[in-house]
Amino acid sequence: SLGSLTIAEPAMIAECKTRTEVFEISRRLIDRTNANFLVWPPCVEVQRCSGCCNNRNVQCRPTQVQLRPVQVRKIEIVRKKPIFKKATVTLEDHLACKCETVAAARPVT
Amino acid sequence: SLGSLTIAEPAMIAECKTRTEVFEISRRLIDRTNANFLVWPPCVEVQRCSGCCNNRNVQCRPTQVQLRPVQVRKIEIVRKKPIFKKATVTLEDHLACKCETVAAARPVT
């Protein structure tokens, strides 16, 4: 609404920078051939670029990325008993961000 | 993959808690009848519950919510000239979170 402005503080832009986000560890990352297992933990924290830029021609993009392998447990239930296996999932953390020009879509040839 | 576990640190669960997220200020929040304007800032930071819980029957939900009015600018370009107006948008911040049981979907009657 355009009224009752007195108590409203000025909105500050969410600048383009890294923020902590939650990444769900998909079972497909662990094993594409089998669905009868659980992954622990089901989600982890990652650093990702977010926020917005001054105009629509630029987007908040990572300029530096780091791959981080983490160890998870793959828990299979075999004859009602859990079998634990260790698996490595590679997470992608964004280390630095920048408002970058969005490349115009190339014409399909 | 199930190999090269030596350098992988144990994955830590992204616990259910408030995290800073980016909220895009939709133009529909300001004016549903007119599309010929910009909103500044286009996005702001909000606090939101995220993370995961111990099992699938529970979800990370806010237990305490606060509404926060903020002042944005509605920018119309009329005959190549900007006209600024002030508008208030009410943001929702999550103050506290909890892993809560997911209520079973009620049967449609």
């Epitope: 001054n54 | 900007p82 006209i83």
Partner: antibody, heavy 123, light 106 residues
Amino acid sequence: EVKLQQSGDELVRPGASVKMSCKASGYTFTDYVMHWVKQSPGQGLEWIGTIIPLIDTTSYNQKFKGKATLTADKSSNTAYMELSRLTSEDSAVYYCARTSPYYYSSYDVMDAWGQGASVTVSS
Amino acid sequence: NIQLTQSPSLLSASVGDRVTLSCKGSQNINNYLAWYQQKLGEAPKLLIYKTNNLQTGIPSRFSGCGSGTDYTLTISSLHSEDLATYYCYQYDNGYTFGAGTKLELK
């Protein structure tokens, strides 16, 4: 007190470029629009273009497109104008001036001006 | 583009005189007209905006009126410090200035 402080006078060679600044103080930089105006020796005033610092959007007088480039730095409350491929025709005093984009009675009026920056193009 | 024609281009007057400066637009300006005073070596100074609104800090001897294409600036009693060049400025459609009226001592 509203103040627009412009950079100093410039003596430049033909074909060169010059970038001048206009530092704003005494008001909220992003709540106003910045204009640039040219005044040739003994002549009247000519509007060059406008920048909306809040959203980094520019508008130019057709005559100055390709000649002037307007930018703004919100962090330092400073507007800039770069003039390229200078000729003797560009020798003039250049002013920055602000206008309010809020639709009140004083909307769009240049109510505060910089002191002016003289550019002399000479070989 | 709207053109503004100011008349006269040079006006000689004495201290205490009532002075009237004219500005004519090539099309309707819808009252979006302002007047500026410029002294030698100085930046223009806003006197009147939206045809007849006196800018804060400007003496009340300055007044403006007009509509459509025809506008005037009046100085009810000329002071020596009023000797300057006066420009009209339209901001209804784009931005244009008149060529100016130079006010000098008779």
